[in-house]
Interface confidence: low
């Protein structure tokens, strides 16, 4: 081992704490970059809120037309009776037979009640029912008074939280400009450096200690910072785990419809099955039965019904959509929140260490190149460090960086911030 | 966007064991099952089998049993497919497969395949 | 076991042209048939299923039809992109199994 005098130990440690000193102001212009950010990312969803918006609007003239179109068929007399009685006979089996099938295949749970639920469902429903669509018109409100559930909900908490993180953003710690961070505090004590945090601010101008020698109590300037963000996380993070948010329409939409959504359906009221009609013969032949001859004005309707049921169907996906890219906005803001508190809480720990009385952020204890005879691998350098308030860190550096090398503290340095940084996010 | 990201190839030894991995984003892992597809050498497709994330319970073709074993890891969103006693014959690219629980959805995702190459 | 039988092995057609596939299964298969395109070196990609339901995306020029144990799938105006396999799937079963291909190429 090469013995390495006081003199270069205090030159390491000098290098080592400029390295540790710029990573700091790093930490502290990431917090901006996040802020950014956020910004950029609230700017897109408040976009994406007015297309939404507009697309809702669209969906319900559509919903509106549909149900006007429904309701003056319904005020019809029934036509086509015994044709259309016929094939409903034929049509429930198959529908039956083919629920069932699914009913057992997939929501896996009982069957027998359902069966008997499903032969009442039948039993009661008109094939008038079938005939004008009133299973995809069902569905399309059922559909629309979710979405509109949704929206409400991540508005709520996306305002909650927008409130919180504008009151956040409003300190002068993120209104003060880059070339400000350095900051010498009027009250710090001698022999230190300049600083990145600002006592101008709201947070910690209130906070200001009475005597100049008092140690300055970082954690508890940045304590309401972090809180902030805690709230603005915990108003983002509610709707994910609200009920409505369990299996939403747009997590991973599909042109089928969702397997639970259908189970629900089915064992709920049997609706379910109605979606299957696709899959019978006799139950398609019901819905292209022409009663044109017996009376032109229900053909006419029933056309004007088919168009409009299809816009609206058309109109929902959309909205969907657009729902679901919003959804999107949303977690990723609540992501972004979730970086901002780590690397506040970073922030704050090291504005906290660096009032420490040693003038190094990092010190250097001892250096020893190894031999081809130790237990190390040969031409590695093994350096042990004091970080801050931290126990000794002991860093190996690969033989391709020598000592002699400008790189050589700054691996060391790195590397020492990574461990400490790991062994406080494992407290 | 839902994706299905594979390992890289695989260069194995006869009677040697592999494991393949098959990372899942973009949607809700557990709600939907993932199977596994065998073709060899640009010959037709194979099912080997499916395993539905949510019990974390497999099924397999036959041919495949005892040949195959079907994982997930659900904190990572990653099923896992381990080949043993390798031959010359399982040689091939491997797929995973994304299909709803409805019998009306067939495998709409497929991740972009394994090539597995037994040689001594 | 269901056996998917699928012809022609290859075929070859003109631009702008109409290409047909069948897909015979050993027994009822329901309409749960679905058919892929693949091309070397991706994954396969669903273009239908269910028999005739197109996947989102892709263009009203692919159709299929069919029922029982009979099934087929066609390209209309067929386009340079279209070169590809491609494989009807039964997935009535939960041993699902594929047709044996049908490779297109362009005159």
């Known amino acids: 081992d090469q013995t390495v005098s006081d003199n270069e130990l205090q030159e390491m440690s000098n290098q080592g704490s400029k390295y540790v000193n710029k990573e700091i102001q790093n930490a502290v212009n990431g917090v901006k970059q996040i802020k950014t950010l956020i910004e950029k990312t609230n700017e897109e969803r408040k976009t994406l809120l007015s297309n939404l918006e507009e697309a809702k609007k669209k969906k319900e003239d559509a919903l509106n037309e549909t149900r006007e179109s429904e309701t003056k068929l319904k005020e019809l007399p029934g036509v086509c009776n015994e044709t259309m009685m016929a094939l409903w006979e034929e049509c429930k089996p198959c529908l039956k037979q083919t629920c069932m099938k699914f009913y057992a295949r997939v929501c896996r749970s009982g069957s027998g009640l359902v069966g008997r639920q499903l032969e009442e469902f039948l039993n009661q429903s008109s094939p008038f029912y079938f005939w004008m669509n009133g299973d995809r018109i069902d569905s399309l409100l059922e559909n629309d008074r979710q979405q509109t559930h949704m929206l409400d909900v991540m508005q709520d908490h996306f305002s909650r939280a927008s409130s919180i993180i504008d009151e956040l953003f409003q300190d002068r710690f993120f209104t003060r400009e880059p070339q400000d961070t350095y900051h010498y505090l009027p009250f710090s004590l001698p022999h230190r450096r300049p600083h990145f945090f600002f006592p101008k601010s709201r947070i910690v101008r209130s906070l200001m200690p009475f005597s100049p020698y008092e140690p300055l109590n970082f954690h508890a300037m940045f304590q309401p910072f972090l809180e902030m963000i805690h709230e603005a996380q915990q108003a983002m993070d509610i709707h994910f785990h609200s009920p409505a948010f369990q299996h939403p329409p747009t997590e991973f939409i599909r042109e089928g419809d969702d397997d639970r959504t259908v189970c629900r359906e089915i064992r709920h009221n049997s609706t379910g099955c109605l979606r299957m009609k696709d899959q019978c013969d006799k139950c398609r032949e019901i819905l292209s039965v022409d009663c044109s001859t017996n009376n032109p004005s229900q053909a006419k309707l029933r056309r004007e019904l088919d168009e409009s049921l299809q816009v609206a169907e058309r109109l929902t996906r959309k909205y969907n959509e657009l729902l679901k890219s919003y959804q999107w906005k949303m977690l990723n803001t609540s992501s972004l929140l979730e970086q901002l508190n780590e690397q506040f809480n970073w922030v704050s720990r090291l504005a906290n260490l660096t009032q420490g009385e040693d003038q190094y952020y990092l010190r250097v204890t001892t250096v020893a190149s190894h031999t081809s005879d130790s237990d190390v691998p040969s031409g590695v350098t093994e350096v042990v460090v004091k970080l801050f308030d931290s126990d000794p860190i002991t860093v190996t550096v690969p033989v391709e960086v020598s000592r002699k090398n400008p790189k050589f503290m700054e691996t060391v340095a790195e590397k020492a911030l990574q461990e400490y940084r790991k062994k406080h996010r494992e407290e | 966007e839902v994706q299905l990201q594979q390992s890289g190839p695989e260069l194995e030894k006869p009677g040697a064991s592999v494991k393949i991995s098959c990372k899942a984003s973009?949607?809700?892992?557990?709600?939907?099952?993932m199977n596994w597809v065998k073709q060899n050498n640009g010959k037709s497709l194979e099912w080997i089998g499916n395993?539905?994330?949510?019990?974390?319970?497999?099924n397999y073709n036959q041919k495949f049993k005892g040949k195959a074993t079907l994982t997930v890891d659900k904190s990572s969103s990653t099923a896992y497919m381990q080949l043993k006693s390798l031959t010359s014959e399982d040689s091939a690219v491997y797929y995973c497969?994304?299909?709803?629980?409805?019998?009306?959805?067939?495998?709409?995702?497929w991740g972009q395949g394994t090539s597995v190459t037994v040689s001594s | 076991d269901i056996q998917m039988t699928q012809s022609p092995s290859s075929l070859s057609a003109s631009l702008g042209g109409k290409v047909t596939i069948t897909c015979k299964a050993s027994?009822?298969?329901?309409?749960?048939i679905a058919w892929y395109q693949h091309k070397p070196g991706k994954g396969p990609r669903l273009l239908i299923h269910?028999?005739?339901t197109l996947q989102p995306g892709i263009p009203s020029r692919f159709s299929g039809s069919g029922s029982g144990r009979d099934y087929s799938f066609s390209i209309s105006n067929l386009e340079p992109e279209d070169i590809a396999t491609y494989y009807c799937?039964?997935?009535?079963?939960?041993?699902?199994?594929f047709g044996g291909g049908t490779k297109l190429e362009i005159k």
């Open positions: 269910y028999t005739s």
């Open positions: 799937l039964q997935y009535d079963n939960l041993l699902r199994t």
């Open positions: 027994q009822d298969i329901n309409k749960y």
């Open positions: 497969a994304l299909n709803s629980l409805l019998r009306l959805n067939a495998m709409d995702y």
């Open positions: 973009g949607y809700s892992f557990t709600g939907y099952n």
């Open positions: 395993i539905d994330p949510y019990y974390g319970t497999p």
